[in-house]
Amino acid sequence: HTAAQDNCTCPTNKMTVCSPDGPGGRCQCRALGSGMAVDCSTLTSKCLLLKARMSAPKNARTLVRPSEHALVDNDGLYDPDCDPEGRFKARQCNQTSVCWCVNSVGVRRTDKGDLSLRCDELVRTHHILIDLRHRPTAGAFNHSDLDAELRRLFRERYRLHPKFVAAVHYEQPTIQIELRQNTSQKAAGDVDIGDAAYYFERDIKGESLFQGRGGLDLRVRGEPLQVERTLIYYLDEIPPKFSMKRLTA
């Protein structure tokens, strides 16, 4: 037991306040914004991270406005309601009483309505497609090396079980990472694919959520993999319910 161990911080979430006042001097960390206790041995849920992000000083906030692709998160940041486990509540509302239903990754899956809108259950996002374009390199990356490196990244950095990384596709300069995780497959203690994808997204943008760790330094056989754009597509176990007006827009 050395002095180096006596630092009460949350290695997996820098958006926390920690103090060693738990039972027996255990380090206990609470997420900013919600004040909820977080488990620092694993990833913090995306809902609590978004809430913490919204509680940060305004000048530190960078609004994310992804491009207008049908299945991506076009709504950007909002201050979500999280349940006692830190998951998104199925119904989200803003300060002007506009409400909508979200999936398990917090992405809107219905038209916006008023306070009478009902969202019966939190629909699980079971398939996430992360679409990356890398910066030009001297030559294409070796597909199997790239595949191995990305799988290693999700296993080691995000602690996502390898079975949930369904595939890695590559057609220079596009890389696609498929994450799949059905409700029945997710055991207690398993990292959620939505949380892993969010940590990856923030890493790629140079906004790492990890405490004191360097930013993401992705290399394939020593060659830096620099991403110049990211799109994330979410597929739910139950299809979303948008009006025809939106679908034809």
Epitope: H1, Q5, D6, S19, P20, D21, G22, P23, G24, G25, R26, C27
Partner: antibody, heavy 116, light 107 residues
Framework: QVQLQQSGPEVVKPGASVKMSCRAS????????INWVKQRTGQGLEWIGQ????????HYNKNFKGKATLTADKSSNTAYMQLNSLTSEDSAVYFC?????????WGQGTLVTVSA | DIKMTQSPSSMYAFLGERVTITCKAS??????LSWFQLKPGKSPKSLIY???RLVDGVPSRFSGSGSGQDYSLTISSLDYEDMGIYYC?????????FGGGTKLELK
């Protein structure tokens, strides 16, 4: 190095109160919790409570609520425990301990004898 | 409150013998378990924390193991200075609770 120096033995009358001290040195007092533990002769260890000088937050064993009061003086790096309405059941050695993640540095103990 | 049941309550062992003391929690305690040694007239001494982490300066003959509700302290080769009373402590939740103790004596 970390040291916890506890006050000397006390002989007190039934019904009286006693306040013992635990002076910390070798570390930043406000960074760690102080726990108090009771050991009666021939019996086991019993947890009394915990105080965190960093925020003056505390937790008590329900068996000691009303019996023990924990305080901390940041200016002198000293934790205190006051025991009220003493009976023969309170005759024991009381230890203070600095805890972090279940690892503890212990004081040498304060012997309290309740005797008419 | 979490009840810690420690066994045996007392035991005799030879020098050089392998000794194991167990602690069972009334519910899972997520490895938040410490072991202490207490000798007459002395302060308790921390041996193990987080179920299996050895405190600096404690001889490597001491080791801790277990998970869930069941934990153990093992002394691989008993030394004369290991005589005393051993206690487990759970710090998974308040109130902290100790086991009843195991008195270890020389055979």
């Amino acid at each position: 190095q970390v040291q916890l120096q506890q006050s000397g033995p006390e002989v007190v009358k039934p019904g009286a109160s006693v306040k013992m001290s635990c002076r910390a040195s070798g570390y930043r007092f406000t960074d760690y919790v102080i726990n108090w533990v009771k050991q009666r002769t021939g019996q086991g260890l019993e947890w009394i409570g915990q105080i965190y000088p960093g925020s003056d937050s505390f937790h008590y064993n329900k068996n000691f609520k009303g019996k023990a009061t924990l305080t901390a003086d940041k200016s002198s790096n000293t934790a205190y425990m006051q025991l009220n309405s003493l009976t023969s059941e309170d005759s024991a050695v009381y230890f203070c301990a600095r805890f972090f993640e279940g690892f503890a540095y212990w004081g040498q103990g304060t012997l309290v004898t309740v005797s008419a | 409150d979490i009840k810690m049941t420690q066994s045996p309550s007392s035991m005799y062992a030879f020098l050089g013998e392998r000794v194991t003391i167990t602690c069972k929690a009334s519910q899972g305690i997520n490895n938040y378990l410490s072991w202490f040694q207490l000798k007459p007239g002395k302060s308790p001494k921390s041996l193990i924390y987080r179920a299996n982490r050895l405190v600096d300066g404690v001889p490597s003959r001491f080791s801790g193991s277990g998970s869930g509700q069941d934990y153990s302290l093992t002394i691989s080769s008993l030394d004369y200075e290991d005589m005393g009373i051993y206690y487990c402590l759970q710090y998974d939740e308040f109130p902290l609770t100790f086991g009843g103790g195991t008195k270890l004596e020389l055979k």
